[in-house]
Interface confidence: low
C-alpha cells in the first residue's frame, strides 16, 4: 500500500484514480470501514466519520477519473489506513501525520537552548534532521536539542522527518534575541561628539523592557551607571542619567546614545544591557571609546590615546607630505622641537587609519 506523510495542521490529498476518465461511484472509508465521503449522482456525500467535517474532494476532477480525498487541519490521530473503493477495486493509502514544535517560545535569548519535539503516530519510527539558517546540521529522534543558540541561528530552521523512505519538511522560525554586534569600538578626537548605536538583530511587533549602560573609564577605579532607560512598544524613555557625562538618548529604535564631547576621562569600555519583558536573561553589547589628543607644549609635540586599544595598534606622528617621524605600538608618541607645518597624529591598525588628528606647529623665531 501507498504511504503518505502529512503535517499536523496542514492539508493532505490522498489520491484515488479510476481506470476510465469519467465520473463514477466512489467511497473513501477509514480502517474501521466507516464512510468518510463518496459520490451520489453528481453530489459529494459525507458519512459519519469523525473526519467528515475536515474531509473534501475535488469535484472538478471527478470527470477525469480522479477521486481524491482532501483532509484539512491534520491531526496526529488522523494517522490511519484509508480505503478508496472505486470500480469494484480497493486502493489503500496509509497516512502518517507528524508534528514538530519548539518546546519553548521561539523567541530565545542568545545562549539559551532550543528543543524541538516530534509528535508522531504510535508504531512509527521516524528520524529527524534539522538544518539551521547558518547551515548547521543536527540529527535526532523524538527530540532535537540545540544547547546554546548563537546569533546566526536566527531564521528559518528546516527539519526533515523521514519514515518508510518518505519525507516531510517542517519550517520553524526561530528568533535569537541579540544585538547585531557583540562589541563595537568608537574612535574620536578629543572634543568631538560621540554617537553610540546599538541595533538589534531582530524585530518584534511589541518591544518592551528596560536597559542600562554601565561604564568603566580607563582612568576610574570602578564602573558606574551612565544611563538607565525604559523601552515601551519601541519607544525609549530615559529614567536616570549621570550629570557627568550627560548622555542624550534617541526616543526611537535602534538604541542611540550621544556623548556631547569625547574627553580622555570618558575613554573606556561600556556594557549596555537590555532586559526584555517576559524574557529571562538580558541582551548585552560591549562598546569601547578611544579618545585621541594632540598637543604642543613648548618644544614638545605629543599625541596620546586613551581607552581600550589593542597592543598591535600603531600610533604615529608625521609631518604632512613627509614620512613618519615617529611611530610606536604605544599609547603616546612625541616629537621634541618639531618642524613647523601641519602634523598628523594617526592611530592605525595594519595600515588602516582608525583615528586622525591634525595639529599645526607654527615656526618659532
Amino acid at each position: 500500500k501507498k504511504v503518505v506523510l502529512g503535517k499536523k495542521g496542514d492539508t493532505v490529498e490522498l489520491t484515488c484514480n479510476a481506470s476510465q476518465k469519467k465520473n463514477t461511484q466512489f467511497h473513501w472509508k477509514n480502517s474501521n470501514q466507516i464512510k468518510i465521503l463518496g459520490i451520489q449522482g453528481l453530489f459529494l456525500t459525507k458519512g459519519p466519520s469523525k473526519l467528515s467535517d475536515r474531509a473534501d474532494s475535488r469535484k472538478s476532477l471527478w470527470d477525469q477519473g480522479c477521486f481524491s480525498m482532501i483532509i484539512k487541519n491534520l491531526k496526529i490521530e488522523d494517522s490511519d489506513t484509508y480505503i478508496c473503493e472505486v470500480e469494484n477495486k480497493k486502493e489503500e493509502v496509509e497516512l502518517l501525520v507528524f508534528g514538530l514544535t519548539a518546546n519553548s517560545d521561539t523567541h530565545l535569548l542568545e545562549g539559551q537552548s532550543l528543543t524541538l519535539t516530534l509528535e508522531s503516530p504510535p508504531g512509527s519510527s521516524p528520524s529527524v534532521k534539522c538544518r539551521s539558517p547558518g547551515g548547521k546540521n543536527i540529527q535526532g529522534g523524538r527530540t532535537i536539542s540545540v544547547p546554546q543558540l548563537e546569533r546566526q541561528d536566527s531564521g528559518t530552521w528546516t527539519c526533515t522527518v523521514s519514515q518508510d523512505q518518505k519525507t516531510v519538511e517542517f519550517k520553524i522560525d526561530i528568533v535569537v534575541l541579540a544585538f547585531q554586534k557583540a562589541s563595537s569600538t568608537v574612535y574620536k578626537k578629543e572634543g568631538e561628539q560621540v554617537e553610540f548605536s546599538f541595533p538589534l538583530a531582530f524585530t518584534l511587533e511589541k518591544l518592551t523592557g528596560s536597559g542600562e549602560l554601565w561604564w568603566q573609564a580607563e582612568r576610574a577605579s570602578s564602573s558606574k551607571s551612565w544611563i538607565t532607560f525604559d523601552l515601551k512598544n519601541k519607544e525609549v524613555s530615559v529614567k536616570r542619567v549621570t550629570q557627568d557625562p550627560k548622555l542624550q538618548m534617541g526616543k526611537k529604535l535602534p538604541l542611540h546614545l550621544t556623548l556631547p564631547q569625547a574627553l580622555p576621562q570618558y575613554a573606556g569600555s561600556g556594557n549596555l544591557t537590555l532586559a526584555l519583558e517576559a524574557k529571562t536573561g538580558k541582551l548585552h553589547q560591549e562598546v569601547n571609546l578611544v579618545v585621541m589628543r594632540a598637543t604642543q607644549f613648548q618644544e614638545n609635540l605629543t599625541c596620546e590615546v586613551w581607552g581600550p586599544t589593542s597592543p598591535k595598534l600603531t600610533l604615529s606622528l608625521k609631518l604632512e607630505n613627509k614620512g613618519a617621524t615617529v611611530s610606536k605600538q604605544a599609547k603616546a608618541v612625541w616629537v621634541l622641537n618639531p618642524e613647523a607645518g601641519m602634523w598628523q597624529c594617526l592611530l592605525s591598525d595594519s595600515g588602516q587609519v582608525l583615528l586622525e588628528s591634525n595639529i599645526k606647529v607654527v615656526p618659532t623665531w
Partner: antibody, heavy 120, light 107 residues
C-alpha cells in the same frame, strides 16, 4: 504569511516561448495547487491552469496545446511556459495559490503580476 | 466550459448606496462560486467564497447569495474604497472561469 513573486522577461517576440517563474516565500509550496491567471489590458481574468507538488496539472483547454507548467519544491518555485506566442498573449500574468478547505476553494494569495508584451 | 455572465458591466453609485451585481452560470454550479475585488494595478482579492461566505478580514458590508445558476453580490453601503472591478468565478468544474467583470464607480 505566504507571498508570491512573479519573474521573467517583460518582452517576448512573436512565435517565441513566454517563460515566467513564481517564487513562494513565507510558507511551503507543498500540499497546495498553484495557478496561473492572465489579464490583457482593460480586460477580464483568464485562468491558464494549475499545478501541485505531485506535478498534477490542469490546463485551460483553450491554451492546453501551448502551456507547460512545472514545479520545483526544493526552490519553492513553480513555472509557466507558453509557446508560439502572438500579440493576443500580451497581458499581466498572475500566479496565485489555490486554497482548498471544507466548502472552500479560492485563490487566496496572489502575486503582484508580471506584465508581458509580445512584440517584435 | 461553464460561461459566467455578469451584469451590469459597469455601474455608477453614490457613497452609502446599496449596490447589487449579478452573475449567471451557463449550467448548475451548486454554490461553487467566488467573488473577487480588483483595484487598478493590483491583483484580485478574494472577498466571498462558496457563494455566500465572507473571507476573513473582509468588511461585513459585502455579501453574496445564490445557488445553482443565479448569484448576487451586494455592497450594503458603498464606501469610497470600494471603487474597483468585481469578478465572479466558478469552481464547479475545470477550467475555472471568471465573469467578464463589473466596473464600479462613484457618482
Amino acid at each position: 504569511q505566504v507571498q508570491l513573486q512573479e519573474s521573467g522577461p517583460g518582452l517576448v517576440k512573436p512565435s517565441e516561448t513566454l517563460s515566467l517563474t513564481c517564487s513562494v516565500s513565507g510558507g511551503s509550496i507543498s500540499t497546495y495547487y498553484w495557478s496561473w491567471i492572465r489579464q490583457p489590458a482593460g480586460k477580464g481574468l483568464e485562468w491558464i491552469g494549475r499545478i501541485c507538488t505531485t506535478e498534477n496539472t490542469n490546463y485551460n483547454p483553450s491554451l492546453k496545446s501551448r502551456v507547460t507548467m512545472s514545479i520545483d519544491s526544493s526552490k519553492n518555485q513553480f513555472s509557466l511556459k507558453l509557446s508560439s506566442v502572438t500579440a493576443a498573449d500580451t497581458a499581466v500574468y498572475y500566479c496565485a495559490r489555490d486554497l482548498e478547505r471544507l466548502n472552500y476553494y479560492g485563490m487566496d494569495v496572489w502575486g503582484q503580476g508580471a506584465t508581458v508584451t509580445v512584440s517584435s | 466550459d461553464i460561461q459566467m455572465t455578469q451584469s451590469p458591466s459597469s455601474l455608477s453609485a453614490s457613497v452609502g448606496d446599496r449596490v447589487t451585481i449579478t452573475c449567471q452560470a451557463s449550467q448548475d454550479i451548486s454554490n461553487y462560486l467566488n467573488w473577487y475585488q480588483q483595484k487598478p494595478g493590483i491583483a484580485p482579492k478574494l472577498l466571498i467564497y462558496d457563494a455566500s461566505n465572507l473571507e476573513t478580514g473582509v468588511p461585513s458590508r459585502f455579501s453574496g447569495s445564490g445557488s445553482g445558476t443565479d448569484f448576487t453580490f451586494t455592497i450594503s453601503s458603498l464606501q469610497p474604497e470600494d471603487i474597483a472591478t468585481y469578478y465572479c468565478q466558478q469552481y464547479d468544474s475545470l477550467p475555472i472561469t471568471f465573469g467578464q467583470g463589473t466596473r464600479l464607480e462613484i457618482k
